[in-house]
Interface confidence: low
């Protein structure tokens, strides 16, 4: 087996393909590395844009796997961050490999809102529950929040009735329609036998990124009776 003494001064390869993926505001860094005779360890550092005296902060130190969860090191999810990764084999270190610029709110994915549908008197009530995300280990809803610039500012609600589709918009800042848990939409029911199918997606401030679209939920009205 080759020892570190056999490695030349710049012969520790640099990690490649440093990428960041984020789902529900939980960003994880991935990278690739060639097979080495000795097990390499990796250090991952994060730099946040917009932080005073912004410096590279250690996120994962001397790890042997090829991923690192950096969610504890993200400031404002609307702001950009960069990641760099270096490898160490024995006492020798590689150069840093840098990621592209990444903003959790702009470049990440957020799961769909959850929907509930029911009939109340002469209307159908649709409950749209905000997607849950994890911020610094805490579960939070992506509802309107004056403390952050990353929140759902509008829901696009798609209502299909007997084949034709209507799109509604709900502004999350309207307190009549929304609270910290959910938004509500009321749709008048026609007197005809009808099937209503509803799906929804959130649109995030600042850049209008959409969440994943919810699964369609349906309700059928038969002569003022309900069949779910």
């Amino acid at each position: 087996e080759m020892g570190t003494a056999d490695l030349g001064p710049s012969s520790v390869p640099t990690p490649t393909n440093v990428t960041i993926e984020s789902y529900n505001m939980n960003p994880i860094v991935y990278w690739e590395y060639q097979i080495m005779p000795q097990v390499p360890v990796f250090t991952v550092e994060v730099k946040n844009y917009g932080v005073k005296n912004s410096e590279w902060i250690d996120a994962c130190i001397n790890i042997s796997h090829h991923y690192c969860n950096i969610s504890d090191h993200v400031g404002d999810p609307s702001n950009s961050l960069w990641v760099r990764v270096k490898a160490r084999v024995g006492q020798k270190e590689s150069a840093y490999a840098k990621s592209e610029e990444f903003a959790v709110c702009r470049d990440g994915k957020i799961g769909p809102p959850k929907l509930d549908i029911r009939k109340e008197e002469k209307q159908i009530m649709i409950d749209i529950f905000h997607p849950s995300v994890f911020v610094n280990g805490d579960e939070q809803e992506v509802d309107y929040d004056p403390e952050t610039t990353c929140y759902i500012r509008v829901y696009n609600v798609y209502v299909r009735m007997n084949g034709s589709e209507i799109q509604y918009k709900i502004l999350t800042q309207k307190e009549d329609d929304c609270d910290e848990i959910q938004c509500q939409l009321a749709i008048p029911v026609s007197s005809l036998n009808s099937q209503y199918c509803v799906s929804a997606e959130g649109v995030l401030h600042v850049w209008g990124v959409t969440t994943e679209k919810s699964k369609e939920v349906c309700i059928t009205i038969f002569n003022s009776s309900i069949k779910g």
Partner: nanobody
Framework: QVQLQQFGGGLVQPGGSLRLSCAVS????????MAWYRQAPGKQRNLVGT???????NYVDSAKGRFTISRDNAKNTVYLQMNSLKPEDTAVYFC????????????????WGQGTLVTVSS
């Protein structure tokens, strides 16, 4: 890559006018609010004024009556019209995309224009 690109600026005499523009590389229709900031030499960056998605504007006292912010959603562009310029308006001007809180305060995001220098001097 989303970018805010600024145009305009330059040297103008006291009492003169200048218009700055900020072009966004995507639709600004869904952006809650946009703002102009300025940074005088050796000073920190300060808010000049804001415009919300429905066109509502707000200005700091030093800009009221002289500066006007407008937006053209079709062109994805925000403008800062500056009239009756004074030497103390000399600064680098920046545009920003952000949000307005329920209390009416502006919250900048990390998305800034590159800055454009305005010099007011005779």
């Amino acid at each position: 890559q989303v970018q805010l690109q600024q145009f305009g600026g330059g040297l103008v005499q006291p009492g003169g006018s200048l218009r700055l523009s900020c072009a966004v590389s995507r639709s600004i229709f869904s952006i809650d609010a946009m703002a102009w900031y300025r940074q005088a030499p050796g000073k920190q960056r300060n808010l000049v004024g804001t415009i919300t998605s429905d066109g509502t504007t707000n200005y700091v006292d030093s800009a009221k009556g002289r500066f006007t912010i407008s937006r053209d959603n079709a062109k994805n562009t925000v403008y800062l019209q500056m009239n009756s310029l004074k030497p103390e308006d000399t600064a680098v001007y920046f545009c920003n995309a952000g949000a307005v809180s329920r209390t009416g305060g502006y919250r900048p995001s990390g998305y800034w224009g590159q800055g454009t220098l305005v010099t007011v001097s005779s």
